[in-house]
Interface confidence: medium
């Protein structure tokens, strides 16, 4: 709304940089062939680029990426009882970000 | 996969807490009747609850919320020229989080 301007602070742009985000570990990252298991932990923290750039034609993108393998528990249910195994999930952390020009494909004439 | 376990660190759960997120300021937050304008900044930082809980039947939810009005620029295009106005957008910050029981509705028999 256009009202109550007095108490409002000027909005500050969320700059393009890495921030901590929560990544949900989906089961198909571990085993696509079997649904009879659980994963623990269900979510982990990752570093991801986010924010806005000063120009409409650029987007905040990762300029440097690192892959980080982590061990999770794969809790298989065998005859109604759990079997705990380790599985490795590779997470993607963004180390640096930049405002990158977005190339919009021109329509074919 | 279950391979290459040696180099992987045990995954740490992303605990239920407030984290900094990027909120996109959509134009309809400012004016639903008119699309002929731009907003600056296009995004801001907010505090939001995220993460996972130790229990299957609970979810990470905000237990304390604060509304924060901020001033943005509404850049109207009038006769192909920009007219700068102020507008207020009210952001929602999460101040505290808790793992809250999710009541799953039982099927009607």
């Amino acid at each position: 709304s256009l009202g109550s301007l007095a108490a409002a602070e000027p909005a500050v742009i969320a700059e393009c940089k890495t921030r901590t985000e929560v990544f949900q570990i989906s089961r198909n990252l571990i085993d696509r062939t079997n649904a009879n298991f659980l994963v623990w932990p269900p979510c982990v923290e990752v570093q991801r680029c986010s924010g806005c750039c000063n120009n409409r034609n650029v987007q905040c993108r990762a300029s440097q990426v690192q892959m980080r393998p982590v061990q999770v528990r794969k809790i298989e249910i065998v005859r109604k009882k759990p079997v705990f195994k380790k599985a490795t999930v590779t997470l993607e952390d963004h180390l640096a970000c930049k405002c990158e020009t977005v190339v919009t494909p021109r329509p074919v004439t | 996969s279950l391979g290459s376990l040696a180099a992987a660190e045990p995954a740490v759960i992303a605990e239920c807490k407030t984290r900094t997120e990027v909120f996109q300021i959509s134009r309809n937050l400012i004016d639903r009747t008119n699309a002929n304008f731009l907003v600056w900044p296009p995004c801001v930082e907010v505090q939001r609850c995220s993460g996972c809980c130790n229990n299957r039947n609970v979810q990470c939810r905000a237990s304390q919320v604060q509304m924060r009005p901020v001033q943005v620029r509404k850049i109207e295009i009038v006769r192909k020229k920009p007219v700068f106005k102020k507008a207020t957008v009210t952001l929602e910050d999460h101040l505290a989080c808790k793992c809250e029981t999710v009541v799953t509705p039982r099927p009607v028999t």
């Epitope: 659980l38 065998v78 759990p82 705990f84 380790k86 | 130790n54 229990n55």
Partner: antibody, heavy 120, light 107 residues
């Protein structure tokens, strides 16, 4: 204070029964899986039984299967171990312990232990 | 049934490094936890998930696990570290404990 307070141990004759209790305080009991672990005099630790946060999953060591029953009352923040058909080899200090997750995991909090002696 | 094997005893001089091993078939495929127990006391968790240290546990305690062997390492061992140590792993629907290792701090 986060703690587990045990009670119910004592002397019992072979073939007899006993019920151990473990009262939890200082944390949300209903969010944690629990286990019973025992230790015979001068011996090592032996896992006895496990129960999930909501009581839906229960597991037992082969040595106690069919004789011991684990249960919990989340409204009373209490864990139980009903021990029937007791044998001399069940003589041990029994510990209740907390798992940090609903499915189990490490035992991050232990009770003070209670001695069960099976003897005629 | 699954078995975890530990040496019955390990001796170390104060300030030296103590290593306690725990072996089992494909143990590296499971998460291993370590417990310390002093005479007349309840066990205390010192390492979980192979290598994580609970809050309040000194940094001199560390752990590793690969292949068939998990190891608890105590660097700069102190007299107060003298205790029984048990490894544990949750395998096929049961928590299995090793037989325990008595750590003696000499002197």
């Amino acid at each position: 204070e986060v703690q587990l307070l045990q009670s119910g141990g004592g002397l019992v004759k072979p073939g007899g029964s006993l019920r151990l209790s473990c009262a939890a305080s200082g944390f949300t009991f209903s969010s944690y899986a629990m286990s019973w672990v025992r230790q015979a005099p001068g011996k090592g630790l032996e896992w006895v039984s496990y129960i999930s946060d909501d009581g839906s999953l229960k597991y037992y060591a082969d040595s106690v299967k069919g004789r011991f029953t684990i249960s919990r009352d989340n409204s009373k923040n209490t864990l139980y171990l009903q021990m029937n058909s007791l044998r001399a080899e069940d003589t041990a200090v029994y510990y209740c312990a907390r798992h940090p997750y609903w499915y189990g995991g490490q035992l991050d909090l232990w009770g003070q232990g209670t001695l069960v002696t099976v003897s005629s | 049934s699954y078995e975890l094997t530990q040496p019955p005893s390990v001796s170390v001089s104060p300030g030296q490094t103590a290593s306690i091993t725990c072996s089992g078939d494909s143990l590296g495929s499971y998460f291993v936890h370590w417990y310390q127990q002093k005479p007349g006391q309840s066990p205390v968790l010192v390492i979980y998930d192979d290598s994580k240290r609970p809050s309040g546990i000194p940094e001199r305690f560390s752990g590793s696990n690969s292949g068939n062997t998990a190891t608890l390492t105590i660097s700069g061992t102190q007299a107060m570290d003298e205790a029984d140590y048990y490894c544990s792993a949750f395998t096929h629907n049961s928590d299995v404990f090793g037989g325990g290792t008595k750590l003696t701090v000499l002197g």
